[in-house]
């Protein structure tokens, strides 16, 4: 169970403040109720902090990236864990601060220099044809916001929906994530029943658009609940 | 500018439901999370629900579990809040907001006002037995 995970000693890289030898400047504190450390914006205390069960990595805040608290641990415990400085070991983009992606199991930089051409070919030289994952849990494609000059075409490599042009999103592609168009009203759309099952899709479709929300199709109402058709309709 | 618009209070009785909304405008929403917050005459303002920038996670404070439920709408700048079951007790003015992704979030995060950078002016619900 998480507790079991959370209470042993195996936790290795938890975000501040469990995790202060992850790196982040200020960020190791003792653990002493009270002590104020950094929880977004603002300040939070230790005494009451809790780790975040995940299921994904977009689940968690910016350096942060979602695994298994132990080490080669059970898949089925997830919680945010904090980023992975330059040169350190990785496994996907994700686990890499931001500013620095995965090559060659190493986090490298990614700065100006670095276009959009090289983190393709990173893309698909760490992840090429072999898709088994070491770990249990889904390579993403994360790359820094400030690598992007111009908002992302249909297609294009992204981090987040904000990164693409107006009408598309950015949505999970086999094992990276790129611009896909908003759905439109009657399209097909993903209704998740189960928190956390998005994280295995790996043809993520976008959200319907605005106006629109993703519901059972009226003559679908009948079917069951396996082959139930869910479209994009209005509010 | 940016603004947080909620509409959809009213009055109603025991039992009875309403849909709250809450539209946002003048910057992109998707990596912020959004969240209900209410505050009663007399009493503080309380956490009521939240959902998170990735849309899977919602989050809702014990007395509104099983009645209440948050929803953002595909373009993620629109929040929704299905109140069912209601009671005089959730009688309050009820307050959109908006926080940003953190660097790390813990299972407080969401309930933290301290954390949400953008609020509405509010909507009274008003609900009598």
């Known amino acids: 169970t998480l507790n079991s995970v959370l209470n042993s000693n195996a936790i290795k890289n938890l975000p501040p403040p469990l995790g202060g030898a992850a790196g982040h400047p200020g960020s190791a504190v003792s653990a002493a109720p009270g002590i104020l450390y950094p929880g977004g914006n603002k300040y939070q205390t230790i005494d009451n902090y809790q780790p975040y069960p995940c299921a994904e990595d977009e689940e968690c805040g910016t350096d942060e990236y979602c695994a298994s608290p132990t080490r080669g641990g059970d898949a089925g415990v997830q919680i945010c864990l904090a980023c992975r400085k330059r040169r350190k070991r990785c496994m996907r983009h994700a686990m890499c601060c931001p500013g620095n992606y995965c090559k060659n199991g190493i986090c490298v930089s990614s700065d100006q220099n670095h276009f959009r051409g090289e983190i393709e070919e990173t893309i698909t030289e760490s992840f090429g044809n072999d898709h088994s994952t070491l770990d249990g849990y889904s390579r993403r494609t994360t790359l820094s916001s400030k690598m992007y000059h111009t908002k992302g075409q249909e297609g294009s490599v992204c981090l987040r929906s904000s990164d693409c042009a107006s009408g598309l999103c950015c949505a999970r592609h086999f094992w990276s994530k790129i611009c896909k168009p908003v759905l439109k009203e009657g399209q097909v759309c993903t209704k998740h029943r189960r928190k956390g099952s998005h994280g295995l899709e790996i043809f993520q479709r976008c959200y319907c658009g605005e106006g629109l929300s993703c519901r059972i199709q009226k003559d679908h109402h009948q079917a069951s609940n396996s082959s139930r058709l869910h479209t994009c309709q209005r509010h | 500018e940016v603004q947080l618009v909620e509409s959809g209070g009213g009055s109603v009785q025991a039992g009875g439901s309403l849909r709250l909304s809450c539209t946002a405008s003048?910057?992109?929403?998707?990596?912020?999370?959004m969240a209900w917050f209410r505050q009663a005459p007399g009493k503080e303002r309380e956490f009521v629900a939240a959902?998170?920038?990735?849309?899977?996670?919602?989050h809702y404070a014990d007395s509104v579990k099983g009645r209440f439920t948050i929803s953002r709408d595909g373009a993620k700048n629109t929040a929704f809040m299905q109140m069912s079951s209601l009671k005089p007790e959730d009688t309050a003015v009820y307050y959109c907001?908006?926080?940003?992704?953190?660097?790390?979030?813990?299972?407080?995060?969401?309930?933290?006002?301290?954390?949400?950078?953008?609020w509405g002016q509010g909507t009274q619900v008003t609900v009598s037995s």
């Open positions: 907001a908006a926080a940003p992704r953190p660097k790390w979030v813990s299972v407080q995060y969401f309930s933290t006002s301290a954390n949400y950078e953008y």
């Open positions: 003048g910057r992109p929403f998707d990596d912020y999370a």
């Open positions: 959902i998170s920038w990735s849309l899977s996670r919602t």
